[in-house]
Amino acid sequence: MMTGTIETTGNISAKKGGSVILQCHLSSTMAQVTQVNWEQHDHSLLAIRNAELGWHIYPAFKDRVAPGPGLGLTLQSLTMNDTGEYFCTYHTYPDGTYRGRIFLEVLESSVAEHSARFQIP
């Protein structure tokens, strides 16, 4: 039985050209996390965080994605095309798969107001 829940940063916004941290947290389960996959709105993989082996950033994103903090992911040099859904997929044993959703809105720099809680200055 899957008892866990995923908390995410929810809906966030950030400036074009800036950076943003995507964060998920799995709680309320004793299951072993074997791998966390980060996926973009078109379901392309951004990165994999393996529990024993560390990070693999996908080749297409190596220049714009940085691992961490923790199991999170940092997106850099944001463009308007980065607007959309992002998913963290926790692969666990024995529970199975948990999935969290984050919506990122990239704003033109002139719009200025953006969430600061998970924003890199």
Epitope: L45, I48, L53, H56
Partner: antibody
């Protein structure tokens, strides 16, 4: 260049423990991931498990209760122990390196493989 | 576990002609797929990772494509040295799993 060489008995009796060692040259096992993969006759390749650069292990849940992977950093080698073997464990056993940072879960170096037969 | 199913089981190709091998995953694995070539009497060799990226030293006649559940390895012009068994593998989730292999022969 990275080279891996499996060694161990080619014949193991049912209910006994299969023991294999992989000697690594040209690279330190304190970097990257070191894996055991097997292929039973006429069947798919099967991941047995791996030991990481830090010594942490992952075992395929289907074999977890019977598998131990360990390492000896002073000899730059790692080992597989598979207990309570049956005929179904007859296979070619490969040791392999995986550079997770660069290639994800894709194995970039394989040993030549060693055939293990389980029979009385 | 994710099941990787390869088709065809075997393939006989005239040198210089193209060849295509299909791999279907039992669930969405995004682009976490690798392809290997195993020549007769040898161990497998990495050809493609992340579905479409050629590994170092792999000739450009080999290409990988696909995402989700359907993946393809193409050889644009088969050469005699390409004979062997080709395997796909997913690493989207543990345990990482392999396809059953496709044997490529020369006519």
């Amino acid at each position: 260049e990275v080279q891996l060489q499996e060694s161990g008995p080619g014949l193991v009796k049912p209910s006994e423990t299969l023991s294999l060692t992989c000697a690594v040259s040209g690279y330190s096992i304190t970097s990257d991931s070191w894996n055991w993969i097997r292929q039973p006759p006429g069947k798919k390749l099967e991941w047995i498990g791996y030991i990481s650069y830090s010594g942490n292990t992952y075992y395929n849940p289907s074999l977890k209760s019977r598998v131990t992977i360990s390492r000896d950093t002073s000899k730059n080698q790692f080992s597989l122990k598979l207990s309570s073997v049956t005929a179904a464990d007859t296979a070619v056993y490969y040791c392999a390196r995986l550079d997770f940072s660069n290639y994800g879960g894709a194995v970039d170096y394989w040993g030549q493989g060693t055939t293990v037969t389980v029979s009385s | 576990d994710i099941v990787m199913t390869q088709t065809p089981l075997s393939l006989s190709v005239t040198p210089g002609q193209p060849a295509s091998i299909s791999c279907k995953a039992s669930q969405n694995v995004r682009t976490a797929v690798a392809w290997y070539q195993q020549k007769p009497g040898q161990s497998p060799q990495l050809m493609i990772y992340s579905a479409s990226y050629r590994y170092t030293g792999v000739p450009d006649r080999f290409s990988g494509s696909g995402s989700g559940t359907d993946f393809t390895l193409k050889i644009s012009r088969v050469e005699a040295e390409d004979v062997g068994v080709y395997y796909c593998q997913q690493y989207y989730t543990t345990p990482w799993t392999f396809g059953g292999g496709t044997k490529v022969e020369i006519k």
